[in-house]
Every structure is written in C-alpha cells, then in structure tokens.
Interface confidence: low
C-alpha cells in the first residue's frame, strides 16, 4: 500500500576532521520508495562536479573535502561552520524533511591572544603567568609545560583559570622556562617560552601611608584620534583621578583595564599599563566596539596601594578597516556562488553583523546589492544569461559597511556550460583582466 515518506534516520551534527570524506546519513520509508535530495543552508545541492558532495544510493551524502573557506595557518579569521545539512525524502504522496545537522570543521589558529611574559617573582608570594589561547573550534584546552616537560599541577598551589597559571606561593624550584600549550582536535599550538626568575624576599618596609590612599577615578574620556596616526588609529582614552589620604605617597600610577564580559561571565584578566601622570594620563591601544572597565592603582617601589573605583566606557563601533578576504566567484546551476572570509579580527572594529555584496555595472548583472545577515560568508546569485559577473564584498558593523574587497569577476559562456577563468591558474578574474579580454 502506498504511503508518504517518513524520515527514519536523521543526519547528525559532526565535526569534519579529514582527511577522509565526511558522511551525512539519511534513511526514509515510503511507498513508492522516496527519492532523497540534500540541502545545505536551505539551498539544494547540485551534486554536479566541481561540487564536492556526492550522493550514495542509500541516501548517504559524502562530502569529499570541505569547501576552501580559508586556512587555519594564515592567521585570518576562519568560518568553522560549513553549514546545516537537511535531507528531503519525496514521493508522489508528499515530502518529509529531516532535522538539520551542522557540519563544522576543527580549527586552531596560530596566534595566542595573550602570550606569557618573562617575570620575576618573590619566594612565598603569588604570581600569575598570563596565557590567552588561540581561538579554536572545538574550544582548545590549555596545559602548561615547564622546562620542556608537562607541569604537574599541585592542588592548592597551582590553579589554571582561563588559560592563565596562578602560583599560590612561589618557591625557588619554580624558577624555569614556562610554555602554554593549547590543544584541540585540529592540533596543538605552543606559546612563546617565558622565563620565570624567583628572588628571595628583600628587607623593606612597605609604606603604611600607601594603604591609606584612596583613589577616585573620576573620568574616562574618549580622545579624538590624532590625524598624525593615519586614517585608522586605535582608540585612546584620557583617565583622570583624584588622590586623597597622605600627602603624595605614591611614586607612580598604573591603569588596569579589561574588556567587559557578559553579566555573570568570568571577568577577563586585567591588563596593566604604567601611566605617565599623577592626576591624569592617556591610555591607548584599545579596540573599537568594545566595553571596557578601568581602574587606577597607586604604587611606591614594590608596594601597591588599593585600587580605585571602576569606571566603564563603551567605545563606539567603527566600520571595519579591512575588506573581507579570499573573495571567490564560482558557477553553479543557473547561479553564481560568491564566498569570502571575514576580515582579520583586529580590523573588525566592533561586531560584524553581516556583509554587503555589490554587483558592478557594465556587466551581465545590473548594478545591485545584497545584504547577508549574520555570520554567513556566502551568497548565491541567480544568473539568467551568459556573460561577465563582477562583485565586491564589504563587512558591516553597527557603524556601517567597511572597506570593500577589490572586484572579482567571472565570465560565464553560452548556456553556462563552463566558466571561463583565464588564465585558469589565477582563479577568478579581476575587473582589469576581464576588460582586457573583452577589448580583445
């Protein structure tokens, strides 16, 4: 008896680790037996070379290799998300749609967010070696090595928090070279080696007056960028504070600042910067589009006074200061696929909320633009005739669209049987190459 399709085996989320193909399973019942088709991010897969997807007779989808979406080794942001796959089973009585399964790729970037630094600690006192592991998917775990061997963590003496190593009481035997190692299924990364020297405590008397100092951080003002710093300066702020208590016991003041985490989240470690001032000073090297917490700490020699109150400052977002990278145009079945990689993280200048894609005039596409919202880094454009297709892509933050990529073009021949990419080893054409060919 005839029956509509029903999904029996749904595809499952998985991590693409290679080198072999990734498999997505889908099994369905129904009479007549249903035909299976797969969709990626809601778009049907063509299964026609050079599409890396291949459909097996039992409905299983093979992904022979992940699309070229950037390289973990080039230090650029990499989209780990290859997309959400769904399968559809259809016969003349209807269609059944599976649950979506996300395929993502294991990535571990090279660049540590914070590298451990050489430091001098005092016997009996605590010290911290900072380490911000590189961004990775899945999130990397952090281990510490000392003098080339894994560090045996002693409860109560060693604590690893957010990657940083906290030593409760320094001992002479803690002297040595430390390295932070980040590991996930994509591999591992080693930080720079940091030299830790341990000194015996010196006889000194801590100025008691310093403990009586109260600092009130009164203002944190965003400074107007200095034109001499070029067109894309990092933001700087002006801190001003008031000191009350004993007469000028502090020899210096240090700014402590960090990006504000979401409420309830564990606070980021405080960065420290010696300030060139006794009541106010400039602090630079911040990032646009971030919320910062600031406080000031007085010190005199090795003695430190109590921290000031905390002030918050929301640095406005700016447009991204670099274009999306690795923009590619590929022919599809009656469509052109545009894909790209986000700009480098240091050029985001806020949260990238999406991308703007322009087609350029004087080609087969009339001048038009599309908005891609969210983290998606690809776009499918319908094409109705052979000819040249040229696009530019720009990343968008809350402040607007940033610098566009340089135009990338693709020449589609009659009936879109094949795409002319001349010279083939150079991939998609630039606008200049295309114009030269059309003149010929």
């Amino acid at each position: 008896q005839d029956s509509p399709p029903q999904i029996l085996v749904h595809p499952q989320d998985q991590l693409f680790q290679g080198p072999g193909p990734a498999r997505m399973s889908c099994q369905a019942s129904g009479q007549p037996p249903p035909t299976i088709r797969w969709l990626l991010n809601g778009q049907p897969l063509s299964m026609v070379p050079p599409d890396p997807h291949h459909l097996l007779p039992d409905g299983t989808l093979l992904l022979l290799q992940p699309p070229a979406r950037g390289h973990a080794h080039d230090g650029q942001a990499l989209s780990t998300d290859l997309g959400v796959y769904t399968c559809e089973a259809s016969n003349r009585l209807g269609t059944a749609v599976s649950r979506g399964a996300r395929l993502s790729v294991a990535v571990l970037r090279e660049d540590f967010q914070i590298q451990p630094r050489d430091m001098v600690a005092v016997v009996g006192e605590q010290f911290t070696l900072e380490c911000g592991p590189p961004w990775g998917h899945p999130e990397p775990t952090v281990s510490w090595w000392k003098d080339g061997k894994p560090l045996a963590l002693q409860p109560g003496r060693h604590t690893v928090s957010g990657g940083s190593l906290l030593m409760a009481r320094a001992e002479k035997s803690d002297e040595g070279t430390y390295m932070c190692v980040a590991t996930n299924s994509a591999g591992h990364r080693e930080s720079r080696a940091a030299r830790v020297s341990i000194q015996e405590p010196q006889d000194y008397t801590e100025p008691v007056e310093l403990l009586a100092v109260r600092i009130q951080l009164e203002n944190v003002t965003l400074l107007n960028p200095d034109p001499a710093e070029g067109p894309k300066p990092r933001p700087a702020v002006w801190l001003s504070w008031k000191v009350s208590g004993p007469a000028a016991p502090a020899q210096s003041y240090t700014a402590l600042f960090r990006t504000q985490t979401a409420p309830g989240g564990q606070g980021a470690p405080w960065a420290e910067e010696l300030l060139a001032g006794w009541q106010s000073a400039e602090l630079g090297g911040l990032h646009w589009g971030q919320d910062y917490e600031f406080k000031v700490r007085p010190s005199s020699g090795r003695a430190r006074g109590p921290d000031s109150n905390v002030l918050l400052l929301r640095l406005p977002e700016k447009v991204p200061s670099a274009p999306p990278q690795e923009v590619t145009l590929k022919p599809g079945n009656g469509t052109v696929f545009v894909s790209w990689v986000p700009p480098p993280a240091e050029n985001h200048n806020g949260i990238i909320r999406g991308y703007q894609v322009w087609s350029l005039g004087n080609t087969s596409l009339p001048p038009a633009n599309w908005t891609v919202v969210g983290e998606q880094t690809q776009l499918e454009i319908a094409t109705h005739m052979p000819g040249s297709y040229c696009v530019q892509v720009a990343a968008v933050t809350g402040a607007g669209a940033g610098e566009p990529s340089r135009p990338v073009c693709l020449l589609l021949e009659q009936a879109m049987e094949r795409a002319t990419q001349e010279p083939s080893e150079h991939g998609p054409w630039t606008l200049e190459q295309l114009r030269a060919t059309l003149k010929r």
Epitope: E218, N219, V220, T221, L222, V237, P263, G264, G265, G267, D291, E293, N309, V310, L311, L312, L313, R314, L315, P316
Partner: antibody
Framework: EVQLVESGGGLVQPGGSLRLSCAAS????????IHWVRQAPGKGLEWVGF????????DYADSVKGRFTISADTSKNTAYLQMNSLRAEDTAVYYC?????????????????WGQGTLVTVSS | DIQMTQSPSSLSASVGDRVTITCRAS??????VAWYQQKPGKAPKLLIY???FLYSGVPSRFSGSGSGTDFTLTISSLQPEDFATYYC?????????FGQGTKVEIK
C-alpha cells in the same frame, strides 16, 4: 550648579500620549547618559530607559519597549520621554537622572543627579 | 534581566544603632552596585557607587562593601535624618535594575 528639572506630567486616559521633558543646567547633556526612572505610588524604583545624546544610543526596559521613545535636543540641553499607548500601570512619578562621569559610554555604577520628578496618572 | 533582592524589606532601629542592609544579585555583577537613600516625596540620593565608594558629600557613617553577588550597606551610627528607604541598584547589564527597597523606621 547641576540641576535636572522634569515637566509635562499630568492626567491622561488609557491609550493616550504624553511627552515629558528633562531640562538640564550646570552641565551639557551631550557628554552624559541620561536615564529615566519611574516610581509607582507606594512602590519601588523601576528603570525605564536611557539616552546618550552624543552617540544617539538609547535602550528601554521591556515593559515600555515599542511604546516609549527617549530623545534629546542638545541645543536646548533637554532630554524627552515620549509615552504612547499609556496604560494604568504606567501611573508613576517619572524621574530623569544623570550617570556619574563624563565620557563616551555608560559608566561608574551610579546616578548622581536626579530631577524632582513629575507625576503621570493614567486613568479613565 | 538581573534581579536584585534586598533584605530586610523594613527594619526598626534607634538613633545610634548600627544598621546593615543586604542586597543579593541573581548573577555576578562585579562591583557594579550603587546605593540610594529616598525620603517621602523626594528624589533618590546617591550614597555609594561602585559597591564601596562614598559619593561626595555623603557622611562617612555610610559604607558599602561586597562584589560578585552579595552587597552590604552599613550605617555605623544611625542619625535622625537617616530614617528613609534605601535602594540598591546594579548597572552591570545594559538594563539597570533596583532592589525592592528597605524602609528604616524609628523604633
């Protein structure tokens, strides 16, 4: 001397509209976050929303989102609270208040100057 | 939104008493807490900001402490003018929230 003065309160029917003003003196509102806070009769304080005139930044409590709009006229050094589709539960004394600090961004965990408040009564 | 729970909701005390009011946040708010005093028919007045910093012009008998989720306002020696309602407020999130208030009455 720093001062905030609210005005524009009164009796309005449910579904009606009202615009409150918060006139500032002794400082320019452009560099500060100005918040609106309300207090229903015999009840506690409830945050309504804020504006940061220099950046045009605004945000609202969920209870008023879509009905209330905060704006500012920096030439008049005044912030406004436009209240539409008023309900009986919006009946309260409305205060405007200034966040401590003079900087780009909300800051410093405290509202140091408050207006005297203006009473809004929503009743048929 | 982050909830701020104050206790007690009211208390009776005498002049010279030491009074402690507590405030608990529903999640970590760092030191983003302020305390206000409000008298009937008047606007709130800022006493403490950043959890422990005395606002200028506020008598030193008022003090604040705490970080994370638990905060305390202490009046070391209650004066006649201190009988009022006290509110805590967090500004760790974009949507500030207030405690429900603690009324300090004369015993």
């Amino acid at each position: 001397e720093v001062q905030l003065v609210e005005s524009g309160g009164g009796l309005v029917q449910p579904g009606g509209s009202l615009r409150l003003s918060c006139a500032a003196s002794g400082f320019t509102i452009n560099g500060y976050y100005i918040h609106w806070v309300r207090q229903a009769p015999g009840k506690g304080l409830e945050w309504v929303g804020f504006i940061y005139p220099a950046g045009g930044d605004t945000d609202y409590a969920d209870s008023v989102k879509g009905r209330f709009t905060i704006s500012a006229d920096t030439s008049k050094n005044t912030a406004y609270l436009q209240m539409n589709s008023l309900r009986a539960e919006d009946t309260a004394v409305y205060y405007c208040a200034r966040l401590i600090g003079n900087k780009f961004g909300w800051s410093s965990y405290g509202m140091d100057y408050w207006g005297q408040g203006t009473l809004v009564t929503v009743s048929s | 939104d982050i909830q701020m729970t104050q206790s007690p909701s009211s208390l009776s005390a005498s002049v010279g008493d030491r009074v402690t009011i507590t405030c608990r946040a529903s999640q970590d708010v760092s030191t983003a807490v302020a305390w206000y005093q409000q008298k009937p028919g008047k606007a709130p007045k800022l006493l403490i900001y950043s959890a422990s910093f005395l606002y200028s012009g506020v008598p030193s008998r008022f003090s604040g402490s705490g970080s994370g989720t638990d905060f305390t306002l202490t009046i070391s020696s209650l004066q006649p003018e201190d009988f009022a309602t006290y509110y805590c407020q967090q500004s760790r999130s974009d949507h500030p929230t207030f405690g429900q208030g603690t009324k300090v009455e004369i015993k």
